[in-house]
């Protein structure tokens, strides 16, 4: 294999915590998103599995505000507006990366963290377990 | 906002780039997820707005593999298995943070990037525009 020369333009890593601790540029680059993307718009109201968005706020985390979806019904909404309990509203979840201040209150020191968030809801056919 | 007192135990930040560049510990902490989470299970097949998962791979990014949802139909699947085109399958999108090496080839220098991903699909009532 070819050895990569240590690039003189790279940040210095002579740090007792290196290499677990690295430099991260927080000037966030938006790839394939506008500055103000029309995120999933008003789908939470128009969906047959509608959801409410709850604000999860933590000043020690970046991003400090995360919106969590909570399905409004156990069932799914029919065309007449009534809920069909033969179907299920379920949350679609995703693991995301966030930054957490560590040590706490330090303005420029963070740790990567993985959290599971509910992004929205979808209507699914239930799994029926038949009893013999 | 509340000013955070400079903690003497915090890493030094007297840097011309501060606070754009911060120290991040890459030992990922798992909050509220097991090491092997059961990701939204088989909802992509059981949903009335089913979706396929496509692999989006970029070795210069972390995570290198991101699974993107693409709705299978324009409409939504009815109980009889047919597609109802009076309803719409739409993607639920979320902005997520990823890491990208910057400058490229530097082993311990990264930049945060925000990308918009489709996590799954939901069935919505269409917006009907009436022409006068």
């Amino acid at each position: 294999g070819i050895a990569i020369p240590r690039n003189s333009g790279c940040p210095n890593s002579e740090d007792k915590n290196f290499p677990r601790t690295v430099m991260v540029n927080l000037n966030i680059h938006n790839r394939n998103t506008s500055t103000n993307p029309k995120r999933s718009s008003d789908y939470y109201n128009r969906s047959t599995s509608p959801w409410n968005l709850h604000r999860n706020e933590d000043p020690e985390r970046y991003p400090s505000v995360i919106w969590e979806a909570k399905c409004r019904h156990l069932g799914c909404v029919k065309a007449d507006g009534n809920v069909d309990y033969h179907m299920n509203s379920v949350p679609i979840q995703q693991e995301i990366l966030v930054l957490r201040r560590e040590p706490r209150h330090c303005p420029n020191s963070f740790r990567l963290e993985k959290i599971l968030v509910s992004v929205g809801c979808t209507c699914v056919t239930p799994i029926v377990h038949h009893v013999a | 906002g509340i000013a955070i007192p400079r903690n003497s135990g915090c890493p030094n930040s007297e840097d011309k780039n501060f606070p754009r560049t911060v120290m991040v510990n890459l030992n990922i902490h798992n909050r509220n997820t097991s090491t092997n989470p059961k990701r939204s299970s088989d909802y992509y097949n059981r949903s009335t707005s089913p979706w396929n998962l496509h692999r989006n791979e970029d070795p210069e990014r972390y995570p290198s593999v991101i699974w993107e949802a693409k709705c299978r139909h324009l409409g939504c699947v009815k109980a009889d298995g047919n597609v109802d085109y009076h309803m719409n399958s739409v993607p639920i999108q979320q902005e997520i943070l990823v890491l990208r090496r910057e400058p490229r080839h530097c082993p311990n220098s990264f930049r945060l990037e925000k990308i918009l991903v489709s996590v799954g699909c939901t069935c919505v009532t269409p917006i009907v525009h009436h022409v006068a």
């Epitope: 070819i2 993985k114 | 990701r39 998962l53």
Partner: antibody, heavy 124, light 109 residues
Amino acid sequence: QVQLQQSGPGLVKPSQTLSLTCAISGDSVSSSSAAWGWIRQSPGRGLEWLGRISYRSKWYNDYAVSVKSRITINPDTSKNQFSLQLNSVTPEDTAVYYCAREVDSIYYSYFDIWGQGTLVTVSS
Amino acid sequence: DIVLTQSPATLSLSPGERATLSCRASQNVWAFYLAWYQQKPGQAPRLLIYGASNRATGVPARFSGSGSGTDFTLTISSLEPEDFATYYCTQYYSSPSLTFGQGTKVEIK
């Protein structure tokens, strides 16, 4: 707990097809948070990853470049197992073959469960 | 393909001593996708460390991993008799590239 049980012949003739099966208990071959792979080990080559399958609304296959033209990994959902087929074998394919579960979270990649290994000798 | 080079090939140490094993990649890899395995004769490899520094379930605290970019290290702080084995590093870069190092054998001096 999750276990992998390998089966298949220990002797294969040159130019023939090597076939091994890996039966899964305690997990599903269609799991959306795992991939199922084959790795082999020989004194000359060390540990060599051969390929994997994973299910994410459809089956995905990844094969090592070194064997891509000769390898097939197939799932059998009815028996909850997966198989390896390696065509046109030569004596260089003689090795201990392992099946393994790869934890396929997008944030990590590692083999946490291994089969017991099967020594396959290619000889006439 | 990325090549992983492990050194030394053999490490001769006594129980109680500290073992430092190196794994060097031919180009930068994500630490999150680097793992270490232990293998004893006649057995399948066993996962020790994933994500370069996370101990797998049931792995004793004397095992630790570190590194990023191209240089990774597995450290055994105080060798126990059962630690004498061969150790492999492995990385996933992108499909279809998953490679193993050639191994470091830790033997009793």
